[in-house]
Amino acid sequence: ITQQDLAPQQRAAPQQKRSSPSEGLCPPGHHISEDGRDCISCKYGQDYSTHWNDLLFCLRCTRCDSGEVELSPCTTTRNTVCQCEEGTFREEDSPEMCRKCRTGCPRGMVKVGDCTPWSDIECVHKESGTKHSGEAPAVEETVTSSPGTPAS
Protein backbone atom coordinates (compact mmCIF):
# COMPACT_ATOMS: atom_id res chain seq x y z
CA ILE A 1 0.00 0.00 0.00
CA THR A 2 1.50 3.31 -1.05
CA GLN A 3 0.18 6.54 0.33
CA GLN A 4 1.19 10.19 0.41
CA ASP A 5 -0.74 12.29 2.89
CA LEU A 6 -0.42 15.89 3.92
CA ALA A 7 -0.95 17.33 7.35
CA PRO A 8 -1.15 21.11 7.24
CA GLN A 9 -3.06 23.20 9.71
CA GLN A 10 -6.82 22.59 9.78
CA ARG A 11 -8.87 25.52 8.52
CA ALA A 12 -12.51 26.48 8.74
CA ALA A 13 -14.28 26.36 5.39
CA PRO A 14 -15.33 29.73 3.97
CA GLN A 15 -19.02 30.62 3.71
CA GLN A 16 -19.10 30.14 -0.06
CA LYS A 17 -17.27 28.08 -2.64
CA ARG A 18 -14.31 29.95 -4.11
CA SER A 19 -12.33 29.31 -7.24
CA SER A 20 -9.52 31.50 -5.99
CA PRO A 21 -7.30 30.75 -2.96
CA SER A 22 -8.38 31.91 0.46
CA GLU A 23 -5.45 33.28 2.48
CA GLY A 24 -3.15 31.66 -0.06
CA LEU A 25 -4.67 28.20 0.32
CA CYS A 26 -7.09 26.04 -1.65
CA PRO A 27 -9.80 23.87 -0.08
CA PRO A 28 -9.74 20.08 0.21
CA GLY A 29 -10.29 18.48 -3.18
CA HIS A 30 -8.23 21.18 -4.91
CA HIS A 31 -4.67 22.31 -5.50
CA ILE A 32 -3.27 25.74 -6.31
CA SER A 33 -2.46 26.81 -9.86
CA GLU A 34 1.11 27.51 -10.96
CA ASP A 35 0.52 31.26 -10.85
CA GLY A 36 -0.99 30.95 -7.36
CA ARG A 37 -4.22 32.66 -8.44
CA ASP A 38 -6.68 29.78 -8.85
CA CYS A 39 -7.78 26.60 -7.18
CA ILE A 40 -7.93 23.60 -9.49
CA SER A 41 -10.07 20.59 -8.68
CA CYS A 42 -8.48 17.20 -8.15
CA LYS A 43 -9.58 14.45 -10.57
CA TYR A 44 -12.10 12.05 -9.00
CA GLY A 45 -10.67 8.55 -8.67
CA GLN A 46 -7.19 9.70 -9.70
CA ASP A 47 -5.96 12.13 -7.07
CA TYR A 48 -7.03 13.96 -3.93
CA SER A 49 -6.18 16.50 -1.24
CA THR A 50 -7.46 16.20 2.32
CA HIS A 51 -6.72 19.65 3.78
CA TRP A 52 -6.51 23.30 2.88
CA ASN A 53 -3.24 23.51 0.95
CA ASP A 54 -1.01 25.32 -1.52
CA LEU A 55 0.21 22.17 -3.25
CA LEU A 56 0.82 22.51 -6.97
CA PHE A 57 -0.61 19.05 -7.57
CA CYS A 58 -3.08 16.73 -5.89
CA LEU A 59 -1.85 13.52 -4.29
CA ARG A 60 -2.14 10.30 -6.28
CA CYS A 61 -4.80 7.88 -5.09
CA THR A 62 -3.64 4.65 -3.47
CA ARG A 63 -4.32 1.45 -5.39
CA CYS A 64 -5.12 -1.50 -3.14
CA ASP A 65 -2.60 -4.32 -3.48
CA SER A 66 -3.53 -7.92 -4.20
CA GLY A 67 -4.39 -9.38 -0.83
CA GLU A 68 -6.30 -6.24 0.10
CA VAL A 69 -9.92 -5.26 -0.28
CA GLU A 70 -11.08 -1.72 -1.01
CA LEU A 71 -13.28 -0.49 1.84
CA SER A 72 -13.94 2.91 0.27
CA PRO A 73 -12.90 4.43 -3.05
CA CYS A 74 -10.70 7.45 -3.57
CA THR A 75 -12.59 10.73 -3.79
CA THR A 76 -11.23 14.21 -4.43
CA THR A 77 -10.98 14.79 -0.67
CA ARG A 78 -10.15 11.34 0.68
CA ASN A 79 -7.68 8.64 -0.27
CA THR A 80 -8.67 5.05 -0.97
CA VAL A 81 -9.14 2.96 2.18
CA CYS A 82 -7.66 -0.52 1.81
CA GLN A 83 -7.93 -3.39 4.28
CA CYS A 84 -6.25 -6.77 4.50
CA GLU A 85 -8.30 -9.72 3.26
CA GLU A 86 -9.88 -12.12 5.74
CA GLY A 87 -7.28 -14.22 7.52
CA THR A 88 -4.52 -11.65 7.09
CA PHE A 89 -3.45 -8.55 9.00
CA ARG A 90 -1.17 -5.53 8.74
CA GLU A 91 1.13 -4.62 11.62
CA GLU A 92 2.06 -1.02 12.40
CA ASP A 93 5.76 -1.79 12.10
CA SER A 94 5.37 -3.46 8.67
CA PRO A 95 2.56 -1.54 6.96
CA GLU A 96 3.68 -2.42 3.44
CA MET A 97 2.13 -5.88 3.34
CA CYS A 98 -0.61 -8.09 4.76
CA ARG A 99 0.63 -11.11 6.72
CA LYS A 100 -1.20 -14.38 7.34
CA CYS A 101 -2.71 -14.71 10.79
CA ARG A 102 -1.59 -17.67 12.89
CA THR A 103 -4.06 -20.55 12.85
CA GLY A 104 -3.74 -21.21 16.56
CA CYS A 105 -1.82 -20.73 19.78
CA PRO A 106 1.19 -22.71 21.03
CA ARG A 107 0.58 -25.51 23.55
CA GLY A 108 -0.02 -24.13 27.03
CA MET A 109 -1.56 -20.95 25.68
CA VAL A 110 -5.11 -19.88 25.06
CA LYS A 111 -6.51 -17.57 22.38
CA VAL A 112 -8.02 -14.35 23.76
CA GLY A 113 -8.17 -12.27 20.57
CA ASP A 114 -9.26 -13.06 17.03
CA CYS A 115 -7.49 -12.36 13.77
CA THR A 116 -8.52 -8.93 12.51
CA PRO A 117 -7.32 -6.92 9.49
CA TRP A 118 -5.01 -4.99 11.84
CA SER A 119 -3.90 -7.67 14.34
CA ASP A 120 -2.89 -11.33 14.57
CA ILE A 121 -4.65 -13.68 16.96
CA GLU A 122 -3.72 -12.93 20.55
CA CYS A 123 -2.46 -15.70 22.79
CA VAL A 124 -1.84 -15.69 26.54
CA HIS A 125 -0.31 -18.27 28.89
CA LYS A 126 -3.04 -20.27 30.60
CA GLU A 127 -1.60 -19.77 34.08
CA SER A 128 0.07 -16.37 34.10
CA GLY A 129 -2.12 -14.63 31.57
CA THR A 130 0.94 -13.01 29.96
CA LYS A 131 0.83 -12.29 26.21
CA HIS A 132 2.83 -14.29 23.69
CA SER A 133 4.49 -12.63 20.76
CA GLY A 134 6.64 -14.20 18.09
CA GLU A 135 6.53 -16.38 15.01
CA ALA A 136 3.70 -18.80 14.37
CA PRO A 137 4.35 -22.08 16.16
CA ALA A 138 4.88 -25.40 14.42
CA VAL A 139 1.58 -26.95 13.33
CA GLU A 140 1.77 -29.87 15.78
CA GLU A 141 2.02 -27.41 18.69
CA THR A 142 -1.07 -25.41 17.77
CA VAL A 143 -4.59 -25.33 19.02
CA THR A 144 -6.55 -24.55 15.88
CA SER A 145 -9.16 -21.86 15.59
CA SER A 146 -10.91 -20.12 12.73
CA PRO A 147 -9.69 -16.61 11.85
CA GLY A 148 -11.87 -13.62 12.57
CA THR A 149 -13.70 -11.71 9.89
CA PRO A 150 -12.76 -8.15 8.87
CA ALA A 151 -14.65 -5.37 10.60
CA SER A 152 -16.85 -3.38 8.26
Partner: antibody, heavy 117, light 110 residues
Amino acid sequence: QVQLVESGGGLVQPGGSLRLSCSASGFSISRYAMIWVRQAPGKGLEYVGFITSDSSAYYASWAKGRFTISRDNSKNTLYLQMNSLRAEDTAVYYCARYTYSDGTDLWGQGTLVTVSS
Amino acid sequence: DIQMTQSPSSLSASVGDRVTITCRASQSISTYLSWYQQKPGKAPKRLIYKASTLASGVPSRFSGSGSGTDFTLTISSLQPEDAATYYCQPNSGIATYGAAFGGGTKVEIK
Protein backbone atom coordinates in the same frame (compact mmCIF):
# COMPACT_ATOMS: atom_id res chain seq x y z
CA GLN B 1 15.86 47.73 -12.94
CA VAL B 2 14.16 44.84 -11.18
CA GLN B 3 15.74 44.47 -7.74
CA LEU B 4 15.27 43.99 -4.00
CA VAL B 5 17.26 45.92 -1.38
CA GLU B 6 17.23 44.92 2.29
CA SER B 7 17.98 47.30 5.15
CA GLY B 8 17.64 47.51 8.94
CA GLY B 9 20.25 44.96 9.94
CA GLY B 10 22.83 45.61 12.64
CA LEU B 11 23.91 44.74 16.15
CA VAL B 12 21.18 44.02 18.70
CA GLN B 13 21.29 42.64 22.23
CA PRO B 14 19.74 39.27 23.14
CA GLY B 15 16.05 39.74 23.88
CA GLY B 16 15.91 42.82 21.67
CA SER B 17 13.87 43.53 18.55
CA LEU B 18 14.66 44.58 15.01
CA ARG B 19 12.62 45.35 11.91
CA LEU B 20 14.12 44.55 8.53
CA SER B 21 12.86 46.24 5.37
CA CYS B 22 13.02 45.02 1.80
CA SER B 23 12.39 47.65 -0.84
CA ALA B 24 11.38 46.46 -4.31
CA SER B 25 11.88 48.32 -7.56
CA GLY B 26 11.00 47.45 -11.14
CA PHE B 27 7.97 45.36 -10.18
CA SER B 28 4.98 45.52 -7.84
CA ILE B 29 5.25 43.27 -4.77
CA SER B 30 1.44 43.23 -4.50
CA ARG B 31 1.32 40.72 -7.35
CA TYR B 32 3.78 38.29 -5.80
CA ALA B 33 4.34 36.07 -2.82
CA MET B 34 7.52 37.14 -1.01
CA ILE B 35 9.85 35.05 1.11
CA TRP B 36 12.46 35.64 3.82
CA VAL B 37 15.46 33.32 4.02
CA ARG B 38 18.40 33.56 6.41
CA GLN B 39 21.93 32.21 6.50
CA ALA B 40 23.97 31.92 9.69
CA PRO B 41 27.74 32.44 9.28
CA GLY B 42 29.25 29.43 7.50
CA LYS B 43 25.90 27.63 7.37
CA GLY B 44 23.28 26.81 4.75
CA LEU B 45 20.12 28.62 3.66
CA GLU B 46 17.20 28.49 6.10
CA TYR B 47 13.60 29.30 5.27
CA VAL B 48 12.06 31.86 7.65
CA GLY B 49 8.60 32.42 6.22
CA PHE B 50 6.63 33.91 3.37
CA ILE B 51 3.67 36.12 2.65
CA THR B 52 1.13 35.52 -0.09
CA SER B 53 -0.12 38.14 -2.53
CA ASP B 54 -3.22 38.54 -0.34
CA SER B 55 -0.95 39.17 2.70
CA SER B 56 -1.39 35.86 4.51
CA ALA B 57 1.85 34.98 6.28
CA TYR B 58 3.29 31.52 6.96
CA TYR B 59 6.39 30.69 8.98
CA ALA B 60 8.95 28.03 9.69
CA SER B 61 8.00 26.28 12.94
CA TRP B 62 10.92 27.86 14.84
CA ALA B 63 9.92 31.40 13.72
CA LYS B 64 6.27 31.28 14.77
CA GLY B 65 5.45 33.73 17.55
CA ARG B 66 8.74 35.65 17.36
CA PHE B 67 8.89 36.75 13.74
CA THR B 68 6.21 38.60 11.78
CA ILE B 69 6.17 39.21 8.03
CA SER B 70 4.15 42.09 6.63
CA ARG B 71 4.05 44.25 3.54
CA ASP B 72 3.13 47.78 2.55
CA ASN B 73 2.09 47.62 -1.08
CA SER B 74 1.84 51.42 -1.35
CA LYS B 75 5.54 51.65 -0.45
CA ASN B 76 6.40 48.48 -2.41
CA THR B 77 8.15 47.25 0.72
CA LEU B 78 8.29 43.96 2.61
CA TYR B 79 9.07 43.78 6.34
CA LEU B 80 10.35 41.24 8.83
CA GLN B 81 9.72 42.11 12.48
CA MET B 82 11.96 40.06 14.77
CA ASN B 83 11.34 39.95 18.53
CA SER B 84 13.02 38.18 21.47
CA LEU B 85 16.18 37.82 19.46
CA ARG B 86 18.75 35.19 20.42
CA ALA B 87 22.42 34.67 19.57
CA GLU B 88 21.40 31.88 17.18
CA ASP B 89 19.39 34.39 15.12
CA THR B 90 22.69 35.94 14.00
CA ALA B 91 22.61 35.62 10.21
CA VAL B 92 22.39 37.36 6.87
CA TYR B 93 18.69 37.83 6.11
CA TYR B 94 17.56 37.76 2.49
CA CYS B 95 14.22 38.78 1.07
CA ALA B 96 13.23 37.27 -2.25
CA ARG B 97 10.39 37.09 -4.74
CA TYR B 98 8.63 33.75 -4.75
CA THR B 99 6.63 32.29 -7.61
CA TYR B 100 4.68 29.13 -6.94
CA SER B 101 5.97 26.99 -9.77
CA ASP B 102 9.25 28.71 -10.60
CA GLY B 103 10.81 29.07 -7.17
CA THR B 104 12.63 32.01 -5.69
CA ASP B 105 13.54 33.93 -8.82
CA LEU B 106 14.82 37.25 -7.47
CA TRP B 107 16.93 37.79 -4.33
CA GLY B 108 18.06 40.84 -2.41
CA GLN B 109 21.71 41.29 -1.46
CA GLY B 110 21.02 40.45 2.19
CA THR B 111 21.40 42.36 5.47
CA LEU B 112 23.46 41.12 8.43
CA VAL B 113 21.83 40.82 11.84
CA THR B 114 24.16 40.23 14.78
CA VAL B 115 22.68 39.32 18.16
CA SER B 116 25.28 39.77 20.87
CA SER B 117 25.73 41.40 24.24
CA ASP C 1 7.44 19.46 6.88
CA ILE C 2 9.30 18.26 3.81
CA GLN C 3 12.92 17.34 4.47
CA MET C 4 15.44 17.78 1.66
CA THR C 5 18.56 15.60 1.76
CA GLN C 6 21.37 16.74 -0.48
CA SER C 7 24.50 14.78 -1.32
CA PRO C 8 27.41 14.98 -1.32
CA SER C 9 27.93 17.81 1.18
CA SER C 10 31.13 18.74 -0.63
CA LEU C 11 33.16 17.63 -3.61
CA SER C 12 36.36 18.53 -5.38
CA ALA C 13 36.65 18.14 -9.14
CA SER C 14 38.84 19.27 -12.00
CA VAL C 15 37.97 21.74 -14.73
CA GLY C 16 36.15 19.85 -17.49
CA ASP C 17 34.81 17.15 -15.16
CA ARG C 18 31.19 16.12 -15.10
CA VAL C 19 29.71 16.86 -11.68
CA THR C 20 26.48 15.42 -10.29
CA ILE C 21 24.65 16.57 -7.15
CA THR C 22 21.56 14.79 -5.84
CA CYS C 23 18.63 15.94 -3.77
CA ARG C 24 16.03 13.68 -2.18
CA ALA C 25 12.67 14.91 -0.84
CA SER C 26 10.99 13.14 2.09
CA GLN C 27 7.77 13.04 0.06
CA SER C 28 6.76 13.55 -3.54
CA ILE C 29 6.99 17.09 -4.90
CA SER C 30 6.33 16.10 -8.53
CA THR C 31 8.74 18.22 -10.61
CA TYR C 32 8.46 21.32 -8.42
CA LEU C 33 12.08 21.66 -7.39
CA SER C 34 14.54 24.53 -7.87
CA TRP C 35 18.34 24.61 -7.74
CA TYR C 36 20.35 27.62 -6.57
CA GLN C 37 24.00 28.59 -6.79
CA GLN C 38 25.62 30.72 -4.09
CA LYS C 39 29.12 32.16 -4.18
CA PRO C 40 30.83 33.42 -0.98
CA GLY C 41 29.46 36.77 0.20
CA LYS C 42 26.75 36.81 -2.48
CA ALA C 43 23.03 36.16 -2.58
CA PRO C 44 21.84 32.86 -4.05
CA LYS C 45 21.03 32.76 -7.76
CA ARG C 46 18.36 30.53 -9.27
CA LEU C 47 19.79 28.07 -11.81
CA ILE C 48 16.95 25.66 -12.52
CA TYR C 49 13.25 25.48 -11.74
CA LYS C 50 10.56 22.84 -12.32
CA ALA C 51 13.36 20.28 -11.91
CA SER C 52 14.75 20.73 -15.42
CA THR C 53 13.99 24.22 -16.77
CA LEU C 54 17.09 26.38 -17.10
CA ALA C 55 16.67 29.91 -15.70
CA SER C 56 17.40 32.83 -18.01
CA GLY C 57 21.11 33.56 -18.50
CA VAL C 58 22.30 30.27 -16.99
CA PRO C 59 24.94 28.41 -19.08
CA SER C 60 23.73 25.26 -20.84
CA ARG C 61 26.34 23.11 -19.05
CA PHE C 62 23.93 23.14 -16.10
CA SER C 63 21.03 20.71 -16.29
CA GLY C 64 18.48 19.24 -13.92
CA SER C 65 16.43 16.09 -13.91
CA GLY C 66 14.14 14.04 -11.70
CA SER C 67 10.60 13.91 -10.40
CA GLY C 68 8.76 12.67 -7.33
CA THR C 69 11.40 12.44 -4.63
CA ASP C 70 14.75 12.10 -6.43
CA PHE C 71 16.45 14.95 -8.29
CA THR C 72 19.82 15.61 -9.88
CA LEU C 73 21.79 18.72 -10.82
CA THR C 74 24.52 18.07 -13.37
CA ILE C 75 27.35 20.31 -14.52
CA SER C 76 28.47 18.69 -17.77
CA SER C 77 31.90 20.35 -17.93
CA LEU C 78 33.01 22.07 -14.72
CA GLN C 79 34.39 25.60 -15.14
CA PRO C 80 36.44 27.64 -12.61
CA GLU C 81 33.52 30.05 -12.09
CA ASP C 82 31.31 27.12 -10.99
CA ALA C 83 33.10 26.94 -7.64
CA ALA C 84 30.17 27.65 -5.28
CA THR C 85 27.66 26.04 -2.96
CA TYR C 86 24.53 24.58 -4.56
CA TYR C 87 21.15 24.22 -2.87
CA CYS C 88 17.87 22.55 -3.77
CA GLN C 89 14.44 23.77 -2.65
CA PRO C 90 10.91 22.39 -3.11
CA ASN C 91 8.34 24.79 -4.56
CA SER C 92 5.08 22.93 -3.97
CA GLY C 93 3.25 23.50 -0.71
CA ILE C 94 5.35 26.22 0.88
CA ALA C 95 2.51 27.18 3.25
CA THR C 96 1.49 23.55 3.73
CA TYR C 97 4.92 22.07 4.35
CA GLY C 98 7.39 24.93 4.62
CA ALA C 99 10.24 25.39 2.19
CA ALA C 100 13.28 23.72 3.68
CA PHE C 101 16.38 23.98 1.55
CA GLY C 102 18.73 21.07 1.08
CA GLY C 103 21.85 21.21 3.23
CA GLY C 104 23.99 22.41 0.34
CA THR C 105 26.84 20.98 -1.72
CA LYS C 106 30.13 22.87 -1.79
CA VAL C 107 31.91 22.44 -5.13
CA GLU C 108 35.63 23.15 -5.19
CA ILE C 109 38.02 23.14 -8.14
CA LYS C 110 41.06 20.86 -7.85
